[in-house]
């Protein structure tokens, strides 16, 4: 019968979402509940994933697969799978030891994650400042300034600011 | 809780297929063996074989050439298919949720069975 | 495959006297994967003992298991008339899953 006598592994028998049983002369055993195998052949089941606290769960566990978390409102998946959650900051801050803190000038974040990063220099392109950096956007470049020469172009040279790439906060 | 209910022809004719299924009602047919176990009249039990949800069977070898067990996870049901069959078919035949593990690992024998339907092969 | 052996066949008793069951195996059977089930009349099996002591939920406790190996005992400690029945034991260590042939338990 279907428990192989042959040569080969009777655990390869044992489809995913069973366990090859030790116990008994290595037949397929169903996974107790909360635990898992994704693939054939497994002489264990592997505990479910449990979230937990600031995780939530995406996905439940089932007999072939684990459990799958995202994070709650305000924080976010860090990591492979999810296994961390970090805090969301606004727009122009970045999270750091003491909490969110807004860029420093001259950079910027367009996220609730992650650091905050220098503005686009243009001038490395050749380009020009078109818009003005803030703490949430980059610069937008533009033409270069040779490219504005009268009657090149249509575009309306922005005006002077204080320092380059910088809007007044 | 966990019901199971046994459906089919009541009679069959020699050297004609035997079909049953078994609807699980209650819960989900999924990440259990599910088990076929017959009767004959006066006589004790004999298990047929059994099936998990994914299709991966075990027959019993008494049986195993005339036996064909499927599943339908969608409908929550399994099915048995008994060829060729004779008088020596006649029985009741129960279908009955296989032994599991509980999260402790303690296990259980087959703890949920159906009311039984009872088949009658003759011409 | 393991053959089962149960002894009596038949159990003559009256109500309120103690019941033994006796169940053999060909050969060893670990305790955690023998069941005993009780059949009435028309009825399905129903489980009494699972990993052959432990009673299933909703099973009085006058009825009780034990043994190991190839030596598995039923005892009912004081017969009620709704006891009167067969009694069936199962091992499901080894493929295939095989029953004894019951001890049916009648009022002497």
């Known amino acids: 019968f279907e428990r192989t006598r042959s040569l080969q592994d009777p655990c390869s028998n044992c489809p995913a979402g069973t366990f090859c049983d030790n116990n008994r002369n290595q037949i397929c055993s169903p996974c107790p509940p909360n635990s898992f195998s994704s693939a054939g052949g497994q002489r264990t089941c592997d505990i479910c994933r449990q979230c937990k606290g600031v995780f939530r769960t995406r996905k439940e566990c089932s007999s072939t697969s684990n459990a799958e978390c995202d994070c709650t409102p305000g924080f976010h998946c860090l990591g492979a799978g999810c296994s961390m959650c970090e805090q969301d900051c606004k727009q122009g801050q970045e999270l750091t030891k003491k909490g969110c803190k807004d860029c420093c000038f001259g950079t910027f974040n367009d996220q609730k994650r992650g650091i905050c990063r220098p503005w686009t220099n243009c001038s490395l392109d050749g380009k020009s400042v078109l818009v003005n950096g803030t703490k949430e956007r980059d610069v937008v470049c533009g033409p270069s300034p040779a490219d504005l020469s009268p009657g090149a172009s249509s575009v309306t040279p922005p005006a002077p600011a204080r320092e380059p790439g910088h809007s007044p906060q | 809780q966990v019901q199971l209910q046994e459906s089919g022809p009541g009679l069959v004719k020699p050297s004609e297929t035997l079909s049953l299924t078994c609807t699980v009602s209650g819960g989900s047919i999924s990440s259990y063996y599910w088990s076929w176990i017959r009767q004959p009249p006066g006589k004790g039990l004999e298990w047929i074989g059994r099936i998990y949800t994914s299709g991966s069977t075990n027959y019993n070898p008494s049986l195993k050439s005339r036996v064909t067990m499927s599943v339908d996870t969608s409908k929550n049901q399994f099915s048995l298919k008994l060829s060729s069959v004779t008088a020596a078919d006649t029985a009741v035949y129960y279908c009955a949720r296989d032994g599991w593990y509980d999260e402790d690992y303690n296990y259980y024998g087959m703890d949920v069975w159906g009311q039984g339907t009872t088949v009658t092969v003759s011409s | 495959e393991i053959v089962m052996t149960q002894s009596p066949a038949t159990l003559s008793l009256s109500p309120g006297e103690r019941a033994t069951l006796s169940c053999r195996a060909s050969q060893s059977v670990s305790s955690n994967y023998l069941s005993w089930y009780q059949q009435k009349p028309g009825q399905a099996p129903r489980l009494l003992i699972y990993?052959?002591?432990t009673r299933a939920t909703g099973i009085p406790a006058r009825f009780s298991g034990s043994g190991s190996g190839t030596d598995f005992t039923l005892t009912i400690s004081s017969l009620q008339p709704e006891d009167f029945a067969v009694y069936y034991c199962q091992q499901d260590y080894d493929l295939p899953w095989t029953f004894g042939q019951g001890t049916k338990v009648e009022i002497k």
């Open positions: 990993g052959a002591s």
